[in-house]
């Protein structure tokens, strides 16, 4: 059974993941130039189901494409440093989902834009945090 301290640690990691994802979405939403239009042409795979921490495998598998799209956004008005940001997210995701069990991610048939993708994973974090509190 999870201890109080392990639950607190999980909650803090989820909060960090949530904030990082919100930061990306905010940075993208602040865009008012042709780069945004180009960013929205990239398609991301969405999880068929995302209700448990093990489903973060589906996010982990999309982190490389996410970094590539964010690299497009680099400018003096985009302060997110994709390499550092994705590296931070990757560390959190690995800790949260654990490496003991191998989970094969199942993806939905429809792909999504970066905005839809981020909103989906933000909602995932928020729903898990809500169950923990």
């Amino acid at each position: 059974a999870p201890t109080s301290s392990s639950t607190k640690k999980t909650q803090l990691q989820l909060e960090h993941l949530l904030l990082d994802l919100q930061m990306i979405l905010n940075g993208i939403n602040n865009y008012k130039n042709p780069k945004l239009t180009r960013m929205l042409t990239f398609k991301f795979y969405m999880p068929k189901k995302a209700t448990e921490l093990k489903h973060l495998q589906c996010l982990e598998e999309e982190l490389k494409p996410l970094e590539e799209v964010l690299n497009l956004a680099q400018s003096k008005n985009f302060h997110l440093r994709p390499r550092d940001l994705i590296s931070n997210i990757n560390v959190i995701v690995l800790e949260l989902k654990g490496s003991e069990t191998t989970f094969m991610c199942e993806y939905a048939d429809e792909t999504a834009t970066i905005v839809e993708f981020l909103n989906r994973w933000i909602t995932f974090c928020q729903s898990i945090i809500s169950t923990l509190t």
Epitope: L12, L19, Q22, L25, L80, R81, D84, N88, I122, Q126
Partner: antibody, heavy 113, light 107 residues
Amino acid sequence: QVQLVQSGAEVKKPGASVKVSCKASGHTFTRYYMHWVRQAPGQGLEWMGIINPSGGYATYAQKFQGRVTMTRDTSTSTVYMELSSLRSEDTAVYYCASGLFIWGQGTLVTVSS
Amino acid sequence: DIQMTQSPSSLSASVGDRVTITCRASQSINSWLAWYQQKPGKAPKLLIYATSTLESGVPSRFSGSGSGTDFTLTISSLQPEDFATYYCQQSYRFPVTFGQGTKVEIK
């Protein structure tokens, strides 16, 4: 006792820049993301942006995009908020807030010619 | 951006009164709402987070409720130290946004 201590009041001329510091003590510096919120005299609270103290990356409210820069120095557990091209409407108290639950005492920035 | 609208903008009440402040979001924010108290010349103080969870050290006369778009802060029995300005705040999506504030004054 977790504490955020901000730098002192500043008076600036229009067009200048100001850099406000916020030093954290009493908890792991990288544990909570740092927000900056400002409050003009007699007005409400306005969110400016957030920085991840571990990674050093930040995102800002669209209103401040291009004028604000948030940075951090992990060796001194300090975050900074720099606002450039100051105008009279930027006269406000600027707060740092760790996770939005621990707040600094505020720094009054007055912009006047 | 998500707009937060508080009502009333000010109210007069007496010690011992039950006070209710409402906050409405322009879209659903689930339960991602916090309430702050601010006294003149001081930094805001967190009272309630996640709609209804009392921050450590906050008296139990403060309570929060609601979900989706409509939220309420209730002070069950107003005390002299409760005269202040109260703000709601959403963290469902960035940018973080605050209500315009409700000033609670002595009648």
